[in-house]
Interface confidence: low
């Protein structure tokens, strides 16, 4: 059957794009690099503005293979620093606590439910 607009706006598609392109610094060509840069910046803004992390939550970065995980080892960054609770200078309130997953120092809500809510209402 033909794909509808609703079908494209699914967590799976978001997840696939995020895992493949977020912080992917080793693309096959510069066109892909440009897309990767765009995806990275979009996700960074989304996570910072909406105080969310990944599509479904921080576990996305743990459960799945991703470009982010290739570029950053798990001990250094279990999830992007944009998942951390920030101070007014947009710096992590406590980076170590964020990395350790201490509640209150990282965002445990996924971004999909925040951005899909308004769309599903229309």
């Amino acid at each position: 059957t033909a794909a509808t607009q609703q079908d494209f706006f699914t967590p799976n598609l978001f997840l696939k794009q995020m895992l493949e392109r977020y912080q992917n610094n080793s693309p096959p060509n510069n066109d892909d690099q440009w897309k990767n840069n765009g995806v990275t910046k979009t996700w960074d803004r989304l996570m910072l503005q909406d105080n969310c992390c990944g599509v479904n939550g921080p576990s996305d970065w743990q459960k799945y293979t991703s470009a982010f995980r290739t570029e950053n080892n798990d001990a250094d960054y279990p999830w992007p620093r944009q998942c951390c609770v920030m101070n007014n200078l947009k710096e992590p309130l406590n980076l170590e606590a964020c990395k350790l997953g201490v509640p209150g120092f990282y965002h445990n809500q996924g971004c999909y439910e925040l951005i899909s809510g308004p769309m599903n209402r229309h």
């Epitope: 610094n25 080793s26 693309p27 510069n30 690099q33 440009w34 990767n36 840069n37 765009g38 910046k41 995980r69 290739t70 570029e71 950053n72 080892n73 250094d76 960054y77």
Partner: antibody
């Protein structure tokens, strides 16, 4: 091919400002970070900062934070560096340089440099 | 800031000789995530801007002759020219592009006898 065109020289008075331009061609301007580097004979090469033309995000070397301001004009594919409150210490060759593959940080392409001379 | 220390500051060699110059960084330039060392070597010939030779410590830029080889990891890096040519007369700089601010070494000036 990638080209970064800079004016050859600028003669300026102490205390004034100068805006050095860097016109890019041969690639998609918004896709690559643009860096600025200072070179003086004794001090060697110093990285001033960089700017992402897609959204004007900047990073500065703290040493140049109050000296240099980086901007871009996407419509003309031109990067600019404004230097303020000039002194003889600012007399140097200033290069603009484009980053490598996308976010690859190395400086892959360089302009020919602009010699800024601060003199009364 | 990461401090880059190059040695020697200058060296004079005969064409055909093998040349080695070193660069030490005050902090590791190894990204443990992708196992790449964020160190670049540049060649600056008289009256010209610097030109990248090697990035990620050991990857040659396209068009760079294979007599230029970069090696090393962490804090200790080496640029080797297997058989120096007259056109290699230049100053060679290493650069940290691991973390901001990017920093350069003071350079090694290569002169040909």
């Amino acid at each position: 091919q990638v080209q970064l065109q800079q004016p050859g020289a600028e003669l300026v008075r102490p205390g004034s400002s100068v805006k050095v331009s860097c016109k890019a061609s041969g690639y998609t301007f918004s896709s690559y970070w643009m860096h600025w580097v200072k070179q003086r004979p004794i001090q060697g090469l110093e990285w001033i900062g960089n700017i992402d033309p897609s959204d004007s995000e900047t990073h500065y070397n703290q040493k140049f934070k109050d000296k240099a301001t980086l901007t871009v004009d996407k419509s003309s594919s031109t990067a600019y560096m404004q230097l303020s409150s000039l002194t003889s210490e600012d007399s140097a060759v200033y290069y603009c340089a484009r980053s490598g593959a996308g976010t690859g940080p190395w400086l892959a392409y360089w302009g020919q440099g602009t010699l800024v001379t601060v003199s009364a | 800031d990461i401090v880059m220390t190059q040695s020697p500051s200058s060296l004079t060699v005969t064409a055909g000789e093998k040349v080695t110059m070193t660069c030490k960084s005050s902090q590791s330039l190894l990204n443990s995530g992708n196992q790449k060392n964020y160190l670049t070597w540049y060649q600056q010939k008289p009256g010209q801007p610097p030109n990248p030779l090697i990035y990620w410590a050991s990857t040659r830029e396209s068009g760079v002759p294979d007599r230029f080889t970069g090696s090393g990891s962490g804090t200790d890096f080496t640029l080797t020219i297997s058989s120096v040519q007259a056109e290699d007369l230049a100053v060679y700089y290493c650069q940290n592009d691991y973390s901001y601010p990017f920093t350069f070494g003071s350079g090694t000036k290569l002169e040909i006898k």
